[in-house]
């Protein structure tokens, strides 16, 4: 079903990025790009 | 600091959660990640919860762990333990942080 | 996923030598977000080295990383008795967050 294909490619794309600025702040220590509180 | 509590003897299938309790530490500011160690084996990345309170997991570990948050604490809920999570789990603020760790045995 | 490949294991240098540890990556680790860390018996993991080879804050110079891609190596030059541990690597990996190397021993004679 295109909706659940569309739904799943947007999870790993947001999880994708959240780990990328995950390891910029744990293994490079990058404070910067830490995720602020919403 | 960063310590971890709520490990204990459970039977297959009980779930479990573990609490990392910090001090000193804002968990608006911080990247919590949790870790496993199964006896005498190597380290596993379990996965982490962000400032804003979402959290996300290795493949092998989704579905089977929750990781949520207070102000004070981070909990790991392990929802259908098996024998293959016996392990100490650890607790630590983005990598370079970490409390002395929890054990859980899993058994029948 | 990637997989991080530690190599060799034990690793034994006499006190004063320089021991190497290597680490390879089955795919590129993103950023060279690599880290390495050192483990005691009964104690949690310790961050020596971050980013391939920034070292940590308080942890001795005799510790250096080097490396990009998916090779990386840790050396520890002027082995001291309080080095004798367990070493992992860990690198990041878009996909899946953290993997960690099977750890190396290292022994001090």
């Known amino acids: 079903h295109s909706d659940g294909i569309f739904t799943d490619s947007y999870s790993r794309y947001r999880k994708q990025m959240a780990v990328k600025k995950y390891l910029a702040a744990v293994l490079g220590k990058r404070y910067k790009q830490r995720v602020k509180n919403k | 600091s960063v310590e971890e509590s709520g490990g204990r003897l459970v039977t297959p299938g009980t779930p479990l959660t573990l609490t990392c309790t910090v001090s000193?530490?804002?968990?608006?500011?911080?990247?919590m990640t949790w870790v496993r160690q199964a006896p005498g084996k190597g380290l596993e990345w379990i996965g982490f919860?962000?400032?804003?309170?979402d959290a996300y997991y290795a493949s092998w570990a989704k579905g089977r762990f929750t990781i949520s948050k207070t102000s004070t604490t981070v909990d790991l809920k392990i929802t259908s333990p098996t024998t293959e999570d016996t392990a100490t789990y650890f607790c630590?603020?983005?990598?370079?942080?970490w409390g002395q760790g929890t054990l859980v045995t899993v058994s029948s | 996923a990637a997989v991080l490949t530690q190599t060799p294991s034990p690793v034994s240098a006499a006190v004063g030598g320089t021991v190497t540890i290597n680490c390879q990556s089955s795919?590129?680790?993103?950023?060279?977000?690599l880290a390495w860390f050192q483990q005691k018996p009964g104690q949690p993991p310790k961050l020596l080295i971050y980013?391939?080879?920034k070292l940590e804050s308080g942890v001795p110079s005799r510790f250096s990383g080097s490396g990009s891609g998916t090779q990386f190596t840790l050396t520890i030059s002027d082995l001291q008795c309080d080095d004798a541990a367990t070493y992992y690597c860990?690198?990041?990996?878009?996909?899946?967050?953290?993997?960690f190397g099977g750890g190396t021993e290292v022994v001090v004679k």
């Open positions: 980013e391939a080879s």
């Open positions: 860990a690198g990041g990996d878009i996909s899946e967050g953290v993997a």
């Open positions: 630590a603020r983005d990598l370079d942080l």
């Open positions: 795919e590129s680790v993103y950023g060279n977000y």
């Open positions: 919860i962000d400032a804003g309170g």
């Open positions: 000193g530490i804002d968990l608006n500011s911080y990247y």
